[in-house]
Structure formats: structure tokens, C-alpha cells
């Protein structure tokens, strides 16, 4: 044996945004013939010697960070990457408006707010259809989402979340959903995200809500363009995946 | 109360063998993992095994793999520890420890230790 | 070599508060395993003292507190006390082959 084994894949069916009370399976899955696997749960660090875990009724105390390993022999495999379970409904829902309409003319910019009624300073944004998200940290109860020069792609429904930074695996309930319209369109295949698309229900959301976006800027406006990874910042912003650190 | 109590030690010539034993009370004994830990005669504490709880998953300090073998016993509330190819480097007094356990979880520290029992290895 | 790395000996007065640190790396107190601390007094087998980094036993004095913060972590012992005198072993876990590593202890003296 040189070097360790590849590493397995850790996912949560049907998804890692787990409403409060609902269930969640985390499945961890390597190469075939695998002779025992590792589940951990981060913080505080714990294991159990199976290749599943099944969480009948969400609690808030099943939210965190997993990873899992397994073992051929004596040889270990290196880890899988961290799935961030999420427990949401814990507090109220946000409210998502559009500012100055929820309609829009193509190429003119448009803000979503979500508005929380805590002091949150972590909102996300998601777009049906979208493998991300948008997550901008604000210090205060509202955070903007700036969108300019509105695209064909920029058409959808989304919703936000709200959280307290320092219970990063605790979120809101999702927001009513908004639909945003961008009008006067000329639509051309090369206008539409390529990215697969998902039901936007909690209940059938992707497994992970990784790779993000995360967007910390100024308050001024930025450019949101689309690409087949979702929507990602242009030049001059970082793009980066979603994963807080211990 | 939770009891660890090993025995097995003693004198034994470079290339020996020396089975250890640990006998545990006081707690459900297949719920846990368990380990051995060894301190050298004024040194520190090194991890040398571990099994879990159902004796699938074991573990060795590179230092011993291939030599020494971990076993359990959960009928018997017993762990073991088979020691082969001894060298003067093995000479060490060897605690049985447990892991601690919650629920359905196995954590990464240990909360109970046996008084250990001396092994020797020397012409 | 120990994994974890601590001083060898510490010392300080009756009354007085002295830290013990242990550094890891990356693939064990950095890759985010919790840090746990020993006392072993002379003679006997070790016990356990601070769990989770910070976390005391039932039965162990609020004199004792234990912190983590990115691949290191302390212990701190305030108002000493004579029978605090003893070796003090850090631990955590190593990631890349699933083993338990300890520092590599350090000798607290209570002095006068």
C-alpha cells in the first residue's frame, strides 16, 4: 500500500438543510469491498463504526460538521470532505423583498433584502435551480444582495435563511419565496444557466449546499453574472466555498 | 464503580512473548472501545492499540504493528494484548483504558484507567 | 518524539497560576480534533482531567481550566496547591491514521 486510499463521499438524503423534526440519512461511500467505515461528527469530535447515519427527528443538536473515513486492512483512507448538516426552522422566518420591484427590466439592477426580525449578522441567499448559494455576511438585521445589470438568468425564485455567526448550523426558517421577473426578454439558449436544476422544497434540496459563494464587500452594488457554476461574482471578487472553520 | 484491572506482566527475554490481560466491571464492557497505553520507566504515555467495541475496528502505534495483537473478550468482560518479537524498548508498565461513550457516539478520550501492569524485557 | 509537543517542567509558587501548553499540527489539534489533559500523581495511573479542551470531570476543582485555539492548546491551574504536583499529559487525535498521540508530558513542581 502507498500513500492512503481515496477518499469516500459523505452525503445527507434528501438533503443537509434538515427542518427541524423531519429526518435525514448521512451516507458515507467509498470503493467497493470496503471493510469497516468511520462516521464523525466535528465539534465535539465523536465517531460511530458505521457507514450511515440515520437522525429520525432533526434536533438542534444534530447540526455540525461530519466527515467520514473507512479502513481496508490496516490502512486508513484519507477523509472525506466536511458535509455541514443544517438544522433549519430554528428561528422565525426572513422576509425577502425586491427593491424597486420584483419586476424588472432587463439590464436594470435590482436589490434583494432579507430582513430578519434578530440580530443576525449571516443571511444566504438561494435561486431555484442554482448548486449554491449567495451568502453575504452583514453586521446588522438586513442584508442586501445587490444584483446589476439583471440578466435572463437572473430570472427565478428565490428564497433566503438568516443565522447567528456564532451557531453557524442553526438557521431560520426560509423565507416566503420571491419570484423574480426580468421583463423584456429576448430569450437565446445561451441566456439560460446550464447548471442542473432542483426543486426548491427543503424537503428534496440538494444534499450539500456547497460550493458557495461567499460574498463579503462594502455596501456598494456588485456585479452578479451567471455561469455554469451558478451565479458566481466577476473579476475582482473571490470565490470561494462555504465551510466555517472550528 | 468502573474497574480496570490488568495483569499478564512480568520478565520476559528479548523475542519473547507475553499475553496481557485487563479485566473490566462496573460498566457494559461491549459499549466501549478500548485501548493500551504504555509509559516507560520515566517517560511518557504512548499509545500502542485500540479495538472497538465489537472487536471489528483495531488500530496500532506503528511501533507495534505486526507484533503486538489486540483482542476482546465481551462474554468475558476481558481485553488482551498478545505481545511478540519483544524488544528492550517494549519494557514499559501498560495501562488498559476506556473511551468514553455517550449515547451512540465514541469520543476520542479516555476516561477511565486501569493501574497497569509491568513488563519487562531484558537478557 | 512525542506528536504533541510540551514543555518538560513548569513550576511556581502555593497560590500562584501557571499554563502548560501543547502544540500539534494540521493533522491532529489543527485539523480540529479536541485536546484532553491527564494528571498522573506520582505513583498512580494517569486521570482524567479536562476533556474537550475545556470540559472538567466531575470532581475536578474549577482551579484547573484547559482552551484550544488553531493547532495549540493550554492548560491553566491557578491557586496552586501542593498536591497539584505531578506530570500532566496532553491528547488528541491524528487524522491520517486514525491514531491517539500524547505530548510528551510535563512535570509541574509546586515550590516551597
Known amino acids: 500500500q502507498s500513500g492512503p486510499l481515496p477518499k469516500p463521499s459523505l452525503q445527507a438524503q434528501p438533503s443537509s438543510l434538515v427542518p427541524l423534526g423531519q429526518s435525514v440519512i448521512l451516507r458515507c461511500q467509498g470503493p467497493p469491498d470496503v471493510d469497516l467505515y468511520r462516521l464523525e461528527k466535528l465539534k465535539p469530535e465523536k465517531y460511530e463504526d458505521q457507514d450511515f447515519l440515520f437522525i429520525p427527528t432533526m434536533e438542534r443538536s444534530n447540526a455540525g460538521r461530519y466527515r467520514c473515513s473507512y479502513q481496508n486492512g490496516s490502512h486508513w483512507s484519507l477523509p472525506s470532505d466536511q458535509l455541514e448538516l443544517i438544522a433549519t426552522g430554528v428561528y422565525a422566518k426572513p422576509s425577502l423583498s425586491a427593491h424597486p420591484s420584483s419586476a424588472v427590466p432587463q439590464g436594470r439592477d435590482v436589490t434583494l433584502k432579507c430582513q430578519s426580525p434578530y440580530s443576525f449578522d449571516e443571511f444566504v441567499l438561494y435561486k431555484e435551480g442554482d448548486t449554491g448559494s449567495y451568502k453575504r455576511p452583514e453586521k446588522w438585521y438586513r442584508a442586501n444582495f445587490p444584483i446589476i445589470t439583471v440578466t435572463a438568468a437572473h430570472s427565478g425564485t428565490y428564497r433566503c435563511y438568516s443565522f447567528s455567526s456564532s451557531s453557524p448550523y442553526l438557521w431560520s426558517a426560509p423565507s416566503d419565496p420571491l419570484v423574480l421577473v426580468v421583463t423584456g426578454l429576448s430569450a437565446t439558449p445561451s441566456q439560460v444557466p446550464t447548471e442542473e436544476s432542483f426543486p426548491v422544497t427543503e424537503s428534496s434540496r440538494r444534499p450539500s449546499i456547497l460550493p458557495t459563494n461567499k460574498i463579503s464587500t462594502t455596501e456598494k452594488p456588485m456585479n452578479i453574472t451567471a455561469s455554469p457554476e451558478g451565479l458566481s461574482p466577476p473579476f475582482g471578487f473571490a470565490h470561494q466555498h462555504y465551510a466555517k472553520g472550528n | 464503580q468502573v474497574q480496570l484491572v490488568e495483569s499478564g506482566g512480568g520478565l520476559v527475554k528479548p523475542g519473547g512473548s507475553l499475553r496481557l490481560s485487563c479485566a473490566a466491571s462496573?460498566?457494559?464492557?461491549?459499549?466501549?472501545?478500548m485501548s493500551w497505553i504504555r509509559q516507560a520507566p520515566g517517560k511518557g504515555l504512548e499509545w500502542v492499540s485500540s479495538v472497538g467495541s465489537e472487536g471489528k475496528f483495531i488500530d496500532y502505534a506503528a511501533s507495534v504493528k505486526g507484533r503486538f495483537t489486540i483482542s476482546r473478550d465481551n462474554a468475558k468482560n476481558s481485553l488482551y494484548l498478545q505481545m511478540n518479537s519483544l524488544r528492550a524498548e517494549d519494557t514499559a508498565v501498560y495501562y488498559c483504558?476506556?473511551?468514553?461513550?455517550?449515547?451512540?457516539?465514541?469520543?476520542?478520550?479516555?476516561?477511565?484507567w486501569g493501574q497497569g501492569t509491568l513488563v519487562t524485557v531484558s537478557s | 518524539q512525542s506528536v504533541l509537543t510540551q514543555p518538560p517542567s513548569v513550576s511556581g509558587a502555593p497560590g500562584q497560576r501557571v499554563t502548560i501548553s501543547c502544540t500539534g499540527s494540521?493533522?491532529?489539534?489543527?485539523?480540529?480534533?479536541?485536546v484532553h489533559w491527564y494528571q498522573q500523581l506520582p505513583g498512580t495511573a494517569p486521570k482524567l482531567l479536562i476533556y474537550?479542551?475545556?470540559n472538567r470531570p466531575s470532581g475536578v476543582p474549577d482551579r484547573f481550566s484547559g482552551s484550544k485555539s488553531g493547532t495549540s492548546a493550554s492548560l491553566a491551574i491557578t491557586g496552586l496547591q501542593a498536591e497539584d504536583e505531578a506530570d500532566y499529559y496532553c491528547q488528541s487525535h491524528d487524522l491520517g491514521a486514525h491514531v491517539w498521540v500524547f505530548g510528551g508530558g510535563t512535570k509541574l513542581t509546586v515550590l516551597g
Open positions: 462496573g460498566f457494559s464492557f461491549s459499549d466501549h472501545y
Open positions: 494540521s493533522s491532529n489539534i489543527g485539523a480540529g480534533y479536541d
Open positions: 483504558a476506556r473511551h468514553y461513550r455517550e449515547f451512540r457516539w465514541h469520543y476520542y478520550y479516555f476516561d477511565y
Open positions: 474537550g479542551n475545556s
